[in-house]
């Protein structure tokens, strides 16, 4: 029962997380104009992974897509890639985990198969969550770097009284959505991996078998060392799961004038 609950909860948490990762990836507010010195602005700039926008004080909003691939910063491309990989892995993980759910019966699928599928989806969720967290963190780091650079060069003199004020950007809502969503997906993945251990069919203890040696009547119970390997499958699972944890570390280390209503 606890296993089913853990698996179900893991699935739901991952589902919410992946929905959040998709939402964050699509959102336009990855970076927003810093309003620290000027809380009321006539033109409010904000940028996403796919387009940049301006909300005018008039109430109109206009967005422009990044219609180039080669002209975009490598970091932005990397963030896009990480988010897309996260979404794809998460989506596959969701698909696998649906079939792995203990409460869903598909033909005569064995528990061991369900356990393997649960583990697979769990690892996928973990990697998906890490991809999202990494993507958002890379973007946030990029913003922090640019923020201080633009603060240092806040006014670029153009001779005389003319000056170009650089627009400074700070963290947008999408970053927080991405971090939370990535975290949820990660937690969901861990829960799936934990559920997998409970799903794996435990090997039944071997019945005592008598071996008759000549002259002596000794009953060998292949339990001593062998019985301890009755948890072999679990230990094995744990190893795979630990491998998943190592994978986490590896992944983490990669850097007309209409009315507008």
């Amino acid at each position: 029962m606890a296993v089913t609950a853990c698996q179900g909860l893991g699935f739901v948490v991952s589902l919410i997380g992946i929905a959040g990762i998709i939402a964050a990836t699509c959102m336009d507010q990855w970076s927003t104009q810093d309003l620290y010195n000027n809380p009321v602005t006539a033109v409010f700039n904000y940028q996403g992974l796919w387009r940049s926008c301006v909300r005018e004080s008039s109430g109109f909003t206009e967005c422009r897509g990044y219609f180039t691939l080669l002209g975009l910063p490598a970091m932005l491309q990397a963030v896009r890639a990480l988010m897309i990989v996260g979404i794809v892995l998460g989506a596959i993980g969701l698909l696998v985990s649906i079939f792995a759910l203990k409460c869903i019966r598909i033909g005569s699928m064995e528990d061991s198969a369900k356990a393997n599928m649960t583990l697979t989806s769990g690892i996928m969720f973990i990697v998906s969550g890490l991809c999202a967290i990494a993507g958002v963190s890379v973007f946030a780091n990029m913003l922090v770097t640019n923020f201080w650079m633009s603060t240092a060069n806040m006014y670029t003199g153009m001779g005389g009284m003319v000056q170009t004020v650089q627009t400074r950007y700070t963290f947008g809502a999408a970053l927080f959505v991405g971090w939370v969503a990535g975290g949820l997906t990660l937690i969901g993945g861990v829960m799936m991996c934990i559920a997998c251990r409970g799903l794996a069919p435990e090997e039944t203890n071997y019945k005592a078998v008598s071996y008759h040696a000549s002259g002596h009547s000794v009953a060998y119970k292949p339990g001593g060392f062998k019985a301890s390997t009755g948890f072999g499958s679990n230990t094995k699972n744990k190893k795979i799961y630990d491998g998943g944890a190592r994978t986490e570390d590896e992944v983490q280390s990669y850097p007309s004038k209409h009315d507008y209503v």
């Epitope: 006539a42 033109v43 004080s57 008039s58 109430g59 627009t167």
Partner: antibody, heavy 118, light 113 residues
């Protein structure tokens, strides 16, 4: 068609107050900001501030913050600008205008001449 | 506040000739989000309210004749009337729509020679 009709000319004594109205028609009133601009005789244009009819949110030129109050009556699609503590230098034509894309002012009222004289 | 400086203060042009009015801003009016310049041009005839000609530095308002052209980016902008007509006699103003408070140039008076 879009129209902004302002109230008639006013003559006031220094220290008095005046309330100028701007009635909008021909468009969705609550979707657009309405702003106020003044023009002293023979002078250029000076932006006073703007108000959003849906929530009465305002943006005021700091120069006018103690002088001007902007209000809205959505039931009659009318925007009001009240000028207080009038002085002779407040003598000007006051225009209301709808704010369009690009923060441009696309439709203007005919203007209200406010004369401050003792 | 952004200071808008127009030149010349007045301009006399023969009918059919080209008229050019310049507007210099003390700060860039280019929005990074949509790469648009928040500069507007108005025409004001005597005894009338101003009329919107061009917004976003180069977008003509509906009903504005195509002899009126706006150009420029950043801090330097130009309004060009390719072939001046008698009805173009007016005062022309540029306006900053980029930051509060919105500010206007001092105006350029166009006359017929």
């Amino acid at each position: 068609q879009v129209q902004l009709v302002q109230s008639g000319a006013e003559v006031k004594k220094p220290g008095a107050s005046v309330k100028v109205s701007c009635k909008a028609s021909g468009y969705s009133f609550t979707n657009y900001w309405v702003n106020w601009v003044r023009q002293a005789p023979g002078q250029g244009l000076e932006w006073i501030g703007m108000v959003h009819p849906s929530g009465s949110e305002t943006r005021l030129n700091q120069q006018f913050k103690d002088k001007v109050t902007l209000t809205v009556d959505t039931s009659t699609s009318t925007v009001y600008m009240e000028l207080s503590s009038l002085r002779s230098e407040d003598t000007a034509v006051y225009y209301c205008a709808r704010v369009w894309s690009g923060n441009a002012f696309d439709y203007w009222g005919q203007g209200t001449l406010v004369t401050v004289s003792s | 506040d952004i200071v808008m400086t127009q030149s010349p203060d007045s301009l006399a042009v023969s009918l059919g000739e080209r008229a050019t009015i310049n507007c210099l801003s003390s700060q860039s009016l280019l929005a990074s989000g949509n790469q648009r310049n928040y500069l507007t041009w108005y025409q004001q005839k005597p005894g009338q309210p101003p009329k919107l000609l061009i917004y976003w530095a180069s977008t003509r308002d509906s009903g504005v004749p195509d002899r009126f052209t706006g150009s420029g980016s950043g801090v330097d902008f130009t309004l060009t009337i390719s072939s001046v007509q008698a009805e173009d006699v007016a005062v022309y103003y540029c306006q900053n729509g980029f930051s509060f408070p919105f500010t206007f140039g001092q105006g350029t008076k166009l006359e017929i020679k």
